[in-house]
């Protein structure tokens, strides 16, 4: 039975040209996290395997930095980066947990962090 919940940074906004940390946290479970995959719609951004380390997709290699922790730092933001991002936690023995973050990249300096929320 899957008892865990994924807490994410929720709906966030950031300035064009700036950077943002995409962060998820798995709680309420003793399951072991074996791997976290970061995806954007139909594209893989990165994989963090507990044993094998990081894989960064070539299309993001120049502007994605691993971490902090299992998170991902997205740099040199453009308006095209606006959209949904998913953290997919592969765990043993629970299985897969998925968190969603919506990022809006703004032209001006009115960017603000949204509220944190949970996905069961």
């Amino acid at each position: 039975m899957m008892t865990g919940t994924i807490e994410t940074t929720g709906n966030i906004s950031a300035e064009k040209g700036g950077s943002i940390i995409l962060q998820c946290h798995l709680s309420s479970t003793t399951a072991q996290v074996t791997q976290v995959n970061w995806e954007q719609q139909d594209q893989l951004l990165a994989i963090c395997n507990a044993d094998l380390g990081w894989h960064i997709s070539p299309s993001f290699k120049d502007r994605v930095a691993p971490g902090p922790g299992l998170g991902l730092t997205l740099q040199s933001l453009t308006v095209n980066d606006t959209g949904e991002y998913f953290c997919i936690y592969h765990t043993y023995p629970d299985g897969t947990y998925t968190g969603r973050i919506f990022l809006e990249v703004l032209e001006s300096s009115v960017a603000e962090h949204g509220a944190r929320f949970q996905i069961p």
């Epitope: 995806e39 139909d42 594209q43 893989l44 395997n49 044993d51 094998l52 894989h55 070539p58």
Partner: antibody, heavy 119, light 107 residues
Framework: QVQLVQSGAEVKKPGASVKVSCKTS????????MHWVRQAPGQRLEWIGG????????SYNQKFQGRVTITVDTSASTAYMELSSLRSEDTAVYYC????????????WGQGTTVTVSS | DIQMTQSPSSMSASVGDRVTITCKAS??????VVWYQQKPGKAPKLLIY???YRYTGVPDRFSGSGSGTDFTFTISSLQPEDIATYYC?????????FGGGTKLEIK
């Protein structure tokens, strides 16, 4: 240039163990993950597992869990794969392969080591 | 484990032909797919990584595409030296798994 040189062919009896080595050169050993892949005659490639030489972290295919041990000697820039309780279906060519920096694609491979298990 | 199903398992084509090989994953693997070429008695060689990126030194007649579960590998104009077996592989989640291979022969 990058080179992965594996140990020679082995013939083993069922129930025995085999240890295959993979000596590397031409790159910084600890910066690249090392994998082991095998290919039985006429069969598809099969991933056995990998090791991160930087921290010794290993990931194994469950199919081989308990029978396989992947290790490294960082001072010798060498990786090892030991497979125990051998059976005839373990007869295969065993390859070491490194995966690139920040990339899981296996970009350089050893020449292969033939392991024959026969009574 | 994720199953990678390649088709066709073998095919013959003429020099200059456009050759297409498909690979279907049993579940979502995003763009975490690699294509290798293997010649008899030799180790595999990396051709395409992250579904569509050509590895250093690989001729531009080789290309890859796809995302999710369906992937395609194409040789735009077959050359005699392309005779080999081609494998797809996923690294979306361990254990990494390979397709059954496509053996390419010259007509």
């Amino acid at each position: 240039q990058v080179q992965l040189v594996q140990s020679g062919a082995e013939v083993k009896k069922p129930g025995a163990s085999v240890k295959v080595s993979c000596k590397t050169s031409g790159y910084t050993f600890t910066e690249y993950t090392m994998h082991w892949v095998r290919q039985a005659p006429g069969q598809r490639l099969e991933w056995i597992g990998g090791i991160n030489p930087n921290n010794g972290g290993t990931s194994y295919n469950q199919k081989f869990q308990g029978r396989v041990t992947i290790t490294v000697d960082t001072s010798a820039s060498t990786a090892y794969m030991e497979l125990s309780s051998l059976r005839s279906e373990d007869t295969a060519v065993y390859y070491c392969a490194r995966s690139g920096n920040w990339d899981y694609a296996m970009d350089y491979w050893g020449q292969g080591t033939t392991v024959t298990v026969s009574s | 484990d994720i199953q990678m199903t390649q088709s066709p398992s073998s095919m013959s084509a003429s020099v200059g032909d456009r050759v297409t090989i498909t690979c279907k994953a049993s579940q979502h693997v995003s763009t975490a797919v690699v294509w290798y070429q293997q010649k008899p008695g030799k180790a595999p060689k990396l051709l395409i990584y992250s579904a569509s990126y050509r590895y250093t030194g690989v001729p531009d007649r080789f290309s890859g595409s796809g995302s999710g579960t369906d992937f395609t590998f194409t040789i735009s104009s077959l050359q005699p030296e392309d005779i080999a077996t081609y494998y797809c592989q996923q690294h979306y989640i361990t254990p990494w798994t390979f397709g059954g291979g496509t053996k390419l022969e010259i007509k």
